[in-house]
């Protein structure tokens, strides 16, 4: 048999197949099913839906369903000794304390074991202080307050804004400018959208919500306890001290409705502009401490929350290939949820679920994918990604020599306007012609394709009539495949009109009213949106797996390594003296470029042309674009940041959720004007721009002819 | 659904004091303050001040300083307003309003008044 | 303390009719967060007040869309585009953007 016909039994098991057999009826069932109750990452009723998938998973009809567990550091309230923040007056009696706990949704209060809102890895503390209110937290944020308003946060409680950045990164933050304490909460500014009611009538915030979540800055490492290997039943575990990215000062979350109590009295400096100020009905004063009448009062803080060494579990589901069964191609999303999930995560679970139950239903009439296929449901991703790291450390052999790529699934749906796609380069023409033959689901394009839907709505900043395709960053299971180890990925959702609000969230998330309801009463009632991620999420896993000639172009990459050369570069040159007193040159890197440039594009043109019924050749083609994202792995990783090995993109040192491109160079030329020693600050910069080169150049030689 | 109910109508002399109370159903009470309003027969409506349940924190009308205490009791989520040394010029409806924080920051809800007569 | 002042004191309408009320304050109403809170009430005959429109625009749940609200600074209005029989009684403007709240005088609208 040829290989084609060893994958396509009969013609009729093509991609078409496989998308038609998809129903946006069964991934509301599953969304459903999934939802009724909390499945908090290390608790008993996680582990039960682990088992409930595995069962699910084999009856669908994958050749086998595997649970994978670890023991990994956790975070939780401690259930007789709750978290909140007081304000105490001269005495120390406490005169306004925060909510204990959400209010519970319509048809929710008499479920058990919903975890109050938390900080998770908070450590215990009860510090009291004068607050500063730090806006969103971010480097900017303190370069403002620190440098222009010559605010010193050291010895103080500051409360900051969620949004923009990623949680983690407000604490280190604040840890480094000597805070003492943390208060997080969600402006309405950034979690309200005009217009729109408040949970249970609309999907907006209510005052009482509360976003929960980690708050490491664990940089990939995975568990805090064992960095770099799995946390099996023999570890080696290190001492909590050693841990990795653990806060060092406590942190609690509160609601808009306590924020104001605590907003309201703050005194001392006003805002310095308007980007300071959010929709609360307070003077957004940045402190230190309270105006007149309350100068006496203070901030008490009370944490006792405990990190314990808990199991988790991840179901990891295979559907072996008939031709090149050690290649893999992984769809994985995580189960963990705070409380409910209704978006995160089970929105995409229900999604990797119903595509499970139609490659499935293929394979049971006769079909195999040409490559493997796996599916994980993963644990613990909101405690730090940790179910998918440690079983990535666990498998890193296999997955560096036969890992193809990574399809992310966490949450289907972030609003319903237009498709968000984040993905390696190598993905861009997979993408773009994937969507081409997909139906939009939106409203006024019946009849049109989901490529125009979305060209139309959010249109690439550079290329007219293409979509806009964002970098990679973290935040998520995709980081330990693509970062660390080097395997393509690339993840896609359904977004809202709100780019100037990237990484807030959607209203509700990570709170207790984020249930089923919100999403079939207010974001997608016929699941027309999760059918179309799934159409696109599934669509993507069809054609890694399947098609002879593995669907990446090289020459993207090209394109975009030039467009990121050009822009460091540019960040370079806003030093044009010291570039010109260290010698610094970015020669090398414009010329590795080039080269690649020239490889990639006759690389492509060797691709058109070579004989794809011989096997050797097209596997030794195959391997070539397999290893391609491979070759921009540097073995020693980043500066302080061993973990993130991808020399062309990292997540951004200030914001965990997006991607930064040359993250070497870019953190050697940061803020580089206040650094004490510029000599060794420039000579940094020229040793980045040397690893970049090289790297680039490296790549480049992979997709030369072999001999 | 949102309830703030008054106590009964009072008659008082002038000199006297009258406490008036205010009890809350439906809605956190901790999270919102209590306004006190009162309308004089046939006039206009005037803020006498508001209090915090959260904190008890109170921030009353100069007018009545001196002469107003606001109070609360978080146990029966109930408000309380005493004005002393009354006149005939305290006659009038006096409401609770609930002071609907974000996204309102308005009087949201309103109860059904208490009518206080000062007369010898 | 911020004045109120409120024109017409009294405005008869037909049933049908578009109705305006206008509410001047004695300073900006422009909070530092770059919020007006002004709003209207109506008291209709033997009834508490009840917030018809917030923050100057923005209709109070349950309000019918034939009430609209608009103005800056310390100019505002409130229309009624169809007048009907239940929006009879006494409507209020109200600003807390200063410390002490206060109210217009009010406007009673009533049948021609």
């Known amino acids: 048999k040829s290989s084609n016909e060893a994958t396509n039994i009969t013609p009729k098991h093509n991609m078409k197949a496989f998308l038609d057999e998809l129903k946006a009826e069964n991934i509301k069932k599953f969304l459903y099913n999934f939802t009724q109750i909390p499945h908090l990452a290390g608790t008993e009723q996680n582990f039960q839906l682990a088992k409930q998938i595995q069962s699910q998973w084999k009856e669908f009809g994958l050749d086998s369903v595997e649970l994978a567990h670890y023991d990994v550091l956790l975070s939780y309230p401690n259930k007789t000794h709750p978290n909140y923040i007081s304000i105490i007056n001269e005495d120390g009696n406490e005169i306004f304390n925060t909510s204990l706990f959400e209010p519970p949704p319509p048809g929710y209060e008499n479920v058990s074991d919903i975890v109050p809102p938390f900080s998770a890895f908070s450590p215990q503390g009860m510090p009291e202080g004068d607050l500063v209110y730090v806006n969103y937290a971010r480097t900017e944020d303190f370069f403002k307050l620190e440098r222009d308003m010559k605010i010193n946060c050291s010895g103080k409680i500051v409360i900051a804004r969620y949004g923009k950045v990623f949680r983690g990164n407000k604490v280190k933050n604040a840890q480094l400018a000597g805070a003492k304490g943390v208060i997080l909460y969600s402006d309405p500014a950034d979690y309200f959208a005009p217009g729109v009611k408040s949970y249970p009538d609309g999907w907006n915030l209510p005052g009482g919500g509360v976003q929960r979540g980690n708050i490491l800055n664990l940089n990939g490492a995975g568990d805090p306890l064992t960095p770099g290997y799995p946390a099996n039943e023999y570890a080696y575990r290190r001492g909590i001290a050693e841990a990795v990215g653990l806060p060092s000062i406590p942190v609690h979350p509160i609601g808009y409705y306590d924020a104001q109590k605590l907003l309201e009295k703050m005194g001392g400096s006003a805002p310095p502009d308007s980007s300071w100020r959010g929709s609360l009905k307070v003077p957004y004063n940045v402190g230190p401490g309270f105006t007149g009448n309350f100068s006496t009062q203070k901030v008490k803080m009370h944490i006792h929350s405990t990190n314990e060494v808990t199991r988790i579990y991840n179901v990891i589901g295979t559907l072996r290939g008939a031709v090149e069964p050690d290649r893999y191609v992984i769809l994985g999303g995580h189960r963990d949820s705070w409380v409910f999930g209704g978006i995160d995560p089970q929105s995409g679970a229900a999604v990797v679920h119903e595509i499970v139950r139609s490659f499935g239903t293929l394979k049971k009439e006769g079909w195999r994918p040409r490559r493997t296929i796996l599916f994980a449901s993963w644990d613990a991703e909101e405690f730090g990604l940790l179910g998918s790291t440690e079983w990535a450390e666990e498998n890193s052999r296999l997955l560096q020599e036969r890992g193809v790529a990574y399809i992310n699934a966490d949450s289907s749906i972030e609003g319903n306007y237009t498709l968000r796609v984040d993905c390696t380069p190598l993905m861009y023409s997979l993408v773009h012609n994937l969507t081409k033959e997909l139906k939009s689901p939106d409203e006024g394009f019946e009849g049109k394709s989901l490529y125009e839907s979305w060209t139309k709505k959010s249109p690439s900043p550079e290329f007219s009539g293409m979509p806009r395709i964002s970098k990679l960053g973290s935040g998520n299971d995709f980081e330990v495949f693509f970062q660390r180890l080097g395997i393509a990925s690339g993840r896609a959702r359904y977004t809202k009109n709100w780019e100037t609000n990237k990484f807030s969230g959607y209203p509700l998330y990570h709170s207790v009213y984020e249930t089923y309801e919100l999403v079939e009463k207010f974001y997608d009632p016929m699941f027309k949106y999760h059918l179309t991620v799934a159409q696109v999420r599934g669509g993507m896993v069809f054609e890694l797996a399947n098609s002879i000639v593995l669907p990446f172009d090289c020459r993207d990459y090209a394109v975009v390594l030039r467009k990121y050369a050009d822009k460091i570069y540019s960040i370079s040159m806003k030093h044009p003296q010291e570039m010109k007193t260290y010698s610094v040159s970015f020669d090398s890197l414009f010329s590795a470029v080039k080269n690649f440039t020239e490889i990639a594009s006759k690389f492509s043109e060797r691709l058109q042309d070579f004989d794809k019924s011989n096997p050797i050749v097209l596997r030794m083609m195959n391997d070539q674009l397999m290893f391609l994202e491979r070759a921009f792995i540097d073995p020693l990783g980043l500066p302080d940041r061993p973990f993130y090995r991808h020399v062309i993109y990292a997540p951004s040192s200030h914001n965990k959720y997006a991607g930064e491109s040359f993250p070497g160079i870019y953190d050697a030329l940061f803020d580089i004007e206040s650094k004490v020693d510029p000599s060794k600050a420039w000579g940094e910069v020229k040793r980045q721009i040397y690893v970049a080169a090289f790297t680039v150049q490296a790549a480049a030689e992979t997709l030369s002819e072999v001999a | 659904q949102v309830q703030l109910v008054q106590s009964g109508a009072e008659v008082k002399k002038p000199g006297a004091s009258v406490k008036l109370s205010c009890k809350a159903s439906?809605?956190?009470?901790?999270?919102?303050?209590i306004n006190w309003v009162r309308q004089a027969p046939e006039q206009g409506l005037e803020w006498m001040g508001g209090i915090s349940p959260g904190d008890g924190n109170t921030n009353y009308n100069e007018n009545f300083k001196g002469r107003v205490t606001m109070t609360i009791d978080t146990s029966s989520s109930t408000a309380y307003i005493e004005l002393s040394r009354l006149t005939s010029d305290d006659t009038a409806v006096y409401y609770c309003a609930r002071d609907g924080n974000f996204p309102y920051y308005a009087m949201d809800s309103w109860g059904q008044g208490t009518t206080v007569t000062v007369s010898s | 303390d911020v004045v109120m002042t409120q024109t017409p004191l009294s405005l008869p309408v037909s049933l049908g009719d578009q109705a305006s009320i206008s509410c001047r304050s004695s300073?900006?109403?422009?909070?530092?967060?770059?919020?007006?809170?002004l709003h209207w009430y109506l008291q209709k005959p033997g009834q508490s007040p009840k917030l018809l429109i917030y923050k100057v625009s923005n209709r109070f749940s349950g309000v019918p869309d034939r009430f609209s609200g608009s103005g800056s600074g310390t100019d505002f209005t409130l229309k009624i585009s169809r007048v009907e029989a239940e929006d009879l009684g006494v409507y209020f403007c109200?600003?807390?953007?200063?410390?002490?709240?206060?109210f217009g005088g009010g406007t009673k609208l009533e049948i021609k």
């Open positions: 109200s600003q807390s953007t200063h410390v002490p709240y206060t």
């Open positions: 439906g809605y956190t009470f901790t999270y919102f303050d």
């Open positions: 300073q900006s109403l422009v909070h530092s967060n770059g919020n007006t809170y």
